[in-house]
Amino acid sequence: VPRWRQQWSGPGTTKRFPETVLARCVKYTEIHPEMRHVDCQSVWDAFKGAFISKHPCNITEEDYQPLMKLGTQTVPCNKILLWSRIKDLAHQFTQVQRDMFTLEDTLLGYLADDLTWCGEFNTSKINYQSCPDWRKDCSNNPVSVFWKTVSRRFAEAACDVVHVMLNGSRSKIFDKNSTFGSVEVHNLQPEKVQTLEAWVIHGGREDSRDLCQDPTIKELESIISKRNIQFSCKNIYRPDKFLQCVKNPEDSSCTSEI
């Protein structure tokens, strides 16, 4: 008789999840000398321990503390790039601008990027069939709690000028319900962070509007200002040219507005 299994609304754990996490850890620690001391088996054990045998709607930040401890990493606090709904361009940017870091350029972010995982209460099995959806099932699921935890820590570590890349093609350029809007914004430390600089990325080729005047950007400015943090905003009209100019700043076409 097959054992009854909870059916959740979201996709199940990414196939070969344990192998993927372990392989990513090994690769990352090989590439980043400052993380060579990390024992990837211990990292996987701590990761697994955060959600295995636990109800996938009752996960807490405390469950991830052993993993957070093992993945402790120092990134230059003044070189942090946050992003919202525009992950690919943010990652392309930090691949070129090597001295800047998104969360996914850190070990923990790199391990979990684009993966899904969950377990089941009282069994050591990983659920490959379905996992809780944030909206339809519950917010305290393994994936959401992980990203909330690492995002909070990442924002708390930031200092000086913090940059955020925002998608100007979205109806809500700044979305209060995104991870950036609900977690990172509220965990920037005014004692350390002087300015939040938003880069609003335009989608259309002929889009010359000043999206920094968008009502949601004004709302972001007001929230940030109330934290005694300065706010600035730049339109990136041509993201393709923007990346090209990051690669080749000497290019003659890079002196004009991007």
């Epitope: 209060k176 609900s182 509220h186 005014p190 300015t195 004004k218 709302e219 400015e221 007001s222 929230i223 200002s225 109330k226 934290r227 005694n228 943090i229 300065q230 706010f231 600035s232």
Partner: antibody, heavy 114, light 108 residues
């Protein structure tokens, strides 16, 4: 944090109050203006942020202007077209930790009467 | 924007007073509480919904998240007789008032 003297004003007059701050920089902390009519509750007027951007309560937008002078450590509230309903004690307040109003001036009484 | 209840409460010395504050939308725990005595400016008691301001008695306790917040005064003393206000510290724009209407606390 200290507000300049208020006093007696006539309807349609323009109110100008100056807040002088010491012990902290206007580049590090925003400043809020709040008022309180006699026997009534606290009412937010507006605020000048560390970057110099100003924000106002919806009711105050059309006739209030907040400016700052970082060199002189002063913040000024200007309110036009006064009516008797603007009679209140006006407070200048530091926008402190987590956006709370942590340091209050003693307040200054403004009376609008013909 | 901020609905505060009750408008007035009377409590004997040693009792417990509970004041509630509701925001029209989530303010992400950016809520502070103030005590105001007659003829004085308000005094900050609690910020970030639950953090006690410097020098404030631990008899004052703040709690809540999202849109619902509570100030609890336990072991009420005569010196607690005052008007208490909540304030949302989330944003200073597009608001009518950032303060609640106030609660008068009478100590019997």
């Amino acid at each position: 944090v200290k507000e300049s003297e208020g006093g007696l004003f006539k309807p349609t007059d323009t109110l100008t109050l100056t807040c002088t701050v010491s012990g902290f920089s206007l580049s590090s902390y925003g400043v809020i203006w709040v008022r309180q009519a006699p026997g009534k509750g606290l009412e937010y007027i507006g605020f000048v942020a560390v970057g110099g951007t100003t924000y106002y309560a919806n009711w105050a937008k059309s006739r209030s202007t907040i400016t700052r002078n970082t060199n002189e450590n002063t913040v000024t509230l200007k309110m036009t077209s006064l009516t008797a309903a603007d009679t209140a004690t006006y407070f200048c307040v530091r926008n402190g930790v987590s956006g709370s109003s942590d340091i209050w001036g003693p307040g200054t009484l403004v009376t609008v009467s013909s | 924007d901020m609905t505060q209840t009750p408008a007035s409460v009377s409590e004997p010395v040693g009792g417990t007073v509970t004041i509630k504050c509701q925001a029209s939308q989530s303010i992400y725990s950016y809520l502070s509480w103030y005590q105001q005595k007659l003829g004085q400016p308000p005094k900050l008691l609690i910020y970030s919904a639950s953090t006690l301001a410097s020098g404030v008695s631990s008899r004052f306790k703040g709690s809540g998240s999202g849109t619902e917040y509570t100030l609890t005064i336990s072991g009420v003393e005569c010196a607690d007789a005052a008007t208490y206000y909540c304030q949302q510290d989330y944003s200073g724009s597009n608001v009518d008032n950032t303060f609640g209407g106030g609660t008068e606390v009478v100590v019997k």
